[in-house]
Each structure stands twice: as C-alpha cells, then as structure tokens.
Interface confidence: low
C-alpha cells in the first residue's frame, strides 16, 4: 500500500460527467491508477484512467453518456473508488459514497457575446452548458470584468442571484478594451461549488463623440 495523506474529490456536472482529482503524498508516479464508479441503482458502471496533473495529484473524467443525457438523479449514490495496480491486483486507495447532487460543479458558461455596446456600457449574454433541467431557475452567477492595468484577481465580482443569462455593465470608460468572464453555481448541494470561469470575452467600448462632454 502507499502511505501518506490521501484526498479524493469529485464533482458532478449535473448531466453525464463526474470529474475527480486524487492527491496522495508519497505516491509512486509510475503507478497505474483509475477511478471506478459504481452506482447503487443503475445497470452501468464506468472507469477512467487517472493522469498526473502535478507532482502528487491525478485527475480524470468519468464520461457517463452523451453530454446532455441525464445519467444520475437526486436520489442516486455512486460508490467511487481509486484503484491502483499492485502487481496483478488493483488495490483500493480511496473510496467515497458520492451523492451527485450534493457535489455539483457545472460546466463553464458558453457562447458569450456582446449584445450591445456603447461608450459607457455593454450588454453581454451567455448560455449555460450541460445543466440539468432539475435546477429549473435555481442557479446563480458571478461575473467579473478585466479593465486595463488590472488582473483578474483584482476585478470586483458582480453577483446575479437568479438565473439571468445576461448583464449590463455600466460606468465603463470610452474607447477601452475590456475582457469579461462569468461562472455559474446551482443553489442545490452541500458541497456544490462554482463552475470554472468562462472563456474571456473581449470587447471594446465605443469612443466618445468628438466635441461632446463624456
């Protein structure tokens, strides 16, 4: 067995993907490991090969079906195991009884686009991707705007406490390049976390009209 501290964290994207990260201090880099998913009330089971993402952590995605298929429900429990090969055997290195709708992380929002841009404001819309119909409107969003000379970490967060797939950014500077990102989170789930940030959308405000007070 491999000694050391182990951490095994997984999230369900609400449709057909469970993403897992396993961290193990002192684990052997050349050991072949996989995640095995065994639902309590489904006829299928699934595995994925853990691939290294850093010195002591590995990640993989359990693809449960077509991207928009609803493979699990709020009553499912999936036993997730990290199995590592030791000779001819697979040894269980970590195990958890995973409640998918208590451990949600949605896909990043997609299809960001500028609906309308002016000198001081910009209206932006987006779409959510592979989100379960179970949520209905029970989603929230965070958005941030990168302005010149600043970093993403410095950007103030704008919170939308409802399923609103657009925003009107105000008090922008004319003729200035900005970038915009948004992320989404269901209200459901004790261990639910924010989605990754969307791909940045670059846009430029219109220049102020000559001879006019801006």
């Amino acid at each position: 067995a491999v000694n050391g501290t182990s951490q095994f964290t997984c999230f369900y994207n609400s449709r057909a993907n469970i993403s897992c990260v396993w961290s193990q201090d002192g684990a052997l880099q050349d050991t072949s490991c996989q995640v095995h998913a065994w639902p309590d009330r489904r006829r299928w089971n699934q595995t994925c090969e853990l691939l290294p993402v850093s010195q002591a952590s590995w990640a993989c995605n359990l693809i449960l079906g077509a991207p928009d298929s609803q493979k699990l429900t709020t009553v499912d429990i999936v036993t997730l195991r990290v199995l590592c090969r030791e000779g001819v055997r697979w040894r269980v290195m970590a195990i958890q009884d995973f409640k998918p709708f208590e451990n949600l992380r949605l896909m990043a929002p997609i299809s960001l686009q500028v609906v309308h841009v002016e000198t001081h404001r910009c209206n932006i819309s987006w779409e959510i991707s592979q989100a379960s119909h179970y949520f209905e409107r029970h989603l929230e969003f965070e958005a941030r705007t990168l302005s010149p000379g600043h970093t993403w970490e410095e950007a103030p967060l704008l919170t939308l406490k409802q399923k609103q797939e657009w925003i009107c950014l105000e008090t922008l500077t004319p003729d200035t390049q900005y970038e915009f990102q948004v992320r989404v989170k269901p209200l459901q789930g004790e261990f639910t976390t924010w989605s990754p940030w969307s791909q940045p959308l670059a846009f430029r405000t219109k220049p102020a009209a000559l001879g006019k007070d801006t």
Epitope: D40, I77, W90, V92
Partner: nanobody
C-alpha cells in the same frame, strides 16, 4: 482470517428456484465485498454477482440479471444468492468469495473462498 461455507445447493427442475447461503466466520464481515462465482466442468470460474460491504451496491453478469438476487445480512455474517427461473446452463459448482480492499470481477482479486456447493438443473 475468514472461513466461508456455502450451502443450499441441490438438484432442481428447470424453472424452479434455489437459495444459496454463504456463512462467514471471523471478524469484520461487513468490511468485505462478497461475490458469487461458478464453475462448470472444463471451464474457468465465472463471475456471477457481487455485493458491496454495506449491501447497497450490487452487480450481476448479464446471463443472470433479472433471475438472481444477491443479498447479505451483516448481523448474521451471511450472504445469500436467490436463484429463480433456473436453467440447465446454470448447472455449476457455486463458490462465494470475500475481498478486503478489492472490488472487481476477477477471481484472483479475492482473498477468501468457500469450498463450493453443487447446483444441478435438469431439463
């Protein structure tokens, strides 16, 4: 160390039912995954079904799905295999197996085995 003893085998007609039991002695029965395998003459031992430590997770080989049901009673240190609608091709020696830390369908992954019980299904 775990000892496993199967019982309940016998000779039945096609379409009838049998219930196999596997009694375990030793500690920590509830920490073992339990499986049933079967062997027909001249063939490899074949995975039939598995039940997880708590009994919440079960899986079956396709050929027995809908006919066989595995269960366990951790208070009695026993695992059961209810076999309904038996067919002649179910004729085999049935073995129960216990795995600590191992969870799979391959026989080499199981640490403890019973001696087997014969099931014969006549047409």
């Amino acid at each position: 160390e775990v000892q496993l003893v199967e019982s309940g085998g016998g000779l039945v007609q096609a379409g009838e039912s049998l219930r196999l039991s596997c009694a375990a002695s030793g500690q920590y029965f509830s920490t073992y995954s339990m499986a049933w395998f079967r062997r027909t003459p001249g063939k490899e031992r074949e995975f039939v079904t598995i039940i997880s430590e708590s009994g919440g997770i079960k899986e079956y080989v396709d050929s027995v799905k809908g006919r066989f049901t595995v269960s366990r009673d951790n208070a009695k240190n026993t695992v059961y295999l209810q076999m309904n609608s038996l067919k002649p091709e179910d004729t085999a020696v049935y073995y129960c197996a216990a795995a600590r830390d191992w969870f799979a369908r391959n026989e080499y992954q199981y640490d403890y085995w019973g001696q087997g019980t014969q099931v014969t299904v006549s047409s």
